[in-house]
Interface confidence: low
Amino acid sequence: WPPPGTGDIVVQAPTQVPGFLGDSVTLPCYLQVPGMEETHVSQLTWSRHGESGSMAVFHQTQGPNYSEPKRLEFVAARLGTELRDASLRMFGLRVEDEGNYTCLFVAFPQGSRSVDIWLRVLAKPQNTAEVQKVQLTGKPVPVARCVSTGGRPPAHITWHSDLGGMPNTSQAPGFLSGTVTVTSLWILVPSSQVDGKSVTCKVEHESFEKPQLLTVNLTVYYPPEVSISGYDNNWYLSQNEATLTCDARSNPEPTGYNWSTTMGPLPPFAVAQGAQLLIRPVDKPINTTFICNVTNALGARQAELTVQVKEGPPSEHSGMSSN
């Protein structure tokens, strides 16, 4: 230990303390007395920068005195004990409590020692994300919405997407004084390729241990996109029956399939079965263009396919069988 009188007393406290709106917070403040140094603390004082007078005082003989008795409390200081811990608890944190505070020890013989602490008032936001259902507009529109409600400071919202697009972010005052609601829209030109894909809203706030990720599955309503499959250009007479399939992508789902030909109704050897067209064996060559017309709530679209059934090659050929 150093000999008496060579050390100095030091006030220890964090430079910044966070607290949550409406909650209580403790501003820690301790007097460190080195070695065998002798000191007598007669008073603890808390004051706020820019304000005259003290907000909390603890006197060695008179005890505590508070500017707001219901909101302030010395955590450890007690009459009849050595005053080494000036930690102060504040209840019901308000936005206006944010600021710089000074913790001061009045000591003999060393004199006064103080330290400044910045109290930061936070509010943890609530986050939601939702899809904005759209149709094919041909121009950029919001397809997803991410809202961080009641944060202090405002939350930071970013988007992650492989689909392109850009954010549009705005702020408005939150319902609690001093808080902010951040609204971010993800904007892109809707297409059928976007439907069912996802984008992720990332919300960052200093009250979170890690960023919150909210995934939104996009919805784009579009009329059917139609193609016909099942024909390989190698169909021959006197072979097995074959099937054409009308492949349709749409949102909402297709409500009806209608098969026809460029000449009008289906020939006798073609039988419609919903999205499929059954082609029965024929005994003479044909060259027919089939049309599949698909309907959903947004409209109807069609695809065409020309089928040729040719004179037969050697019998081991796979023929019309496309099953």
Epitope: G22, T149, G150, A172, F175, L176
Partner: antibody
């Protein structure tokens, strides 16, 4: 004196839309929230949405998302609520309410006189 | 979907004290629920009484006070007057929406 004056009663058929107005006076229109609340016959109150007049930022009760749109016209200090695809259970008195400010947060302060919307075929 | 529950009806004698409560189905009511209390007298417009749990609106008599009572929000009327006979609604904030209670019909008798 803060006042909210709403438009008159409406009778609509199912599937139609209604647009109710709420004209504010006696305070700075752009510096507060306006909520819309409804009360069906014999029922309690149901919050529909709020709009912050200064920015047009809105927050809808999910129950009404897609059917309701809130707007403001700052030049006339008027808030509007449009409800689409009306059903018989939308029959209610619709109120606008200005949120006052206490220094601690916002509260339902001044209410309009209410607009009766009847949905009937 | 949160449900907010109030006493359907209460009676208080003139000059007496009565406490109306507001319970949340999601758990304890906290200051984050921004408890609001609204009064509706027959034939009159609604009137805001209390915001943010315990903040009295300007012009509201001091006999009305808001608080948290256990796990509920509460509106206490001390020294009830005949003109306080009305329907009282509480509203709680759940992150992004208000939910109203069914209302309490207060009779001053």
């Amino acid at each position: 004196q803060v006042q909210l004056v709403q438009s008159g009663a409406e009778v609509k058929k199912p599937g139609a839309s209604v647009k109710v107005s709420c004209k504010a006076s006696g305070y700075t229109f752009t510096s507060s929230y306006i909520s819309w609340v409804r009360q069906a016959p014999g029922q309690g109150l149901e919050w529909i949405a709020w709009i912050y007049a200064g920015t047009g930022d809105t927050n809808y009760n999910q129950k009404f998302t897609g059917r309701v749109t809130m707007t403001t016209d700052t030049s006339t200090s008027t808030a509007y609520m449009e409800l689409r695809s009306l059903r018989s259970d939308d029959t209610a008195v619709y109120y606008c309410a200005r949120h006052g400010y206490t220094g601690r947060g916002w509260y339902f302060a001044v209410w309009g006189q209410g607009t009766t919307v009847t949905v009937s075929s | 979907q949160a449900v907010v529950t109030q006493e359907p009806s209460l009676t208080v004698s003139p000059g007496g004290t009565v406490t109306l409560t507001c319970r949340s189905s999601t758990g304890a009511v906290t200051t984050s629920n921004l408890a609001n209390w609204v009064q509706q007298k027959p034939g009159q417009a609604f009137r805001g009484l209390i915001g943010h749990t315990n903040n009295r609106a300007p012009g509201v008599p001091a006999r009305f006070s808001g608080s948290l009572l256990g796990d509920k929000a509460a509106l206490t009327l001390s020294g009830a007057q005949p003109e306080d006979e009305a329907e009282y609604y509480c509203a709680l904030w759940y992150s992004n929406k208000f939910v109203f209670g069914g209302g309490t019909k207060l009779t001053v008798l």
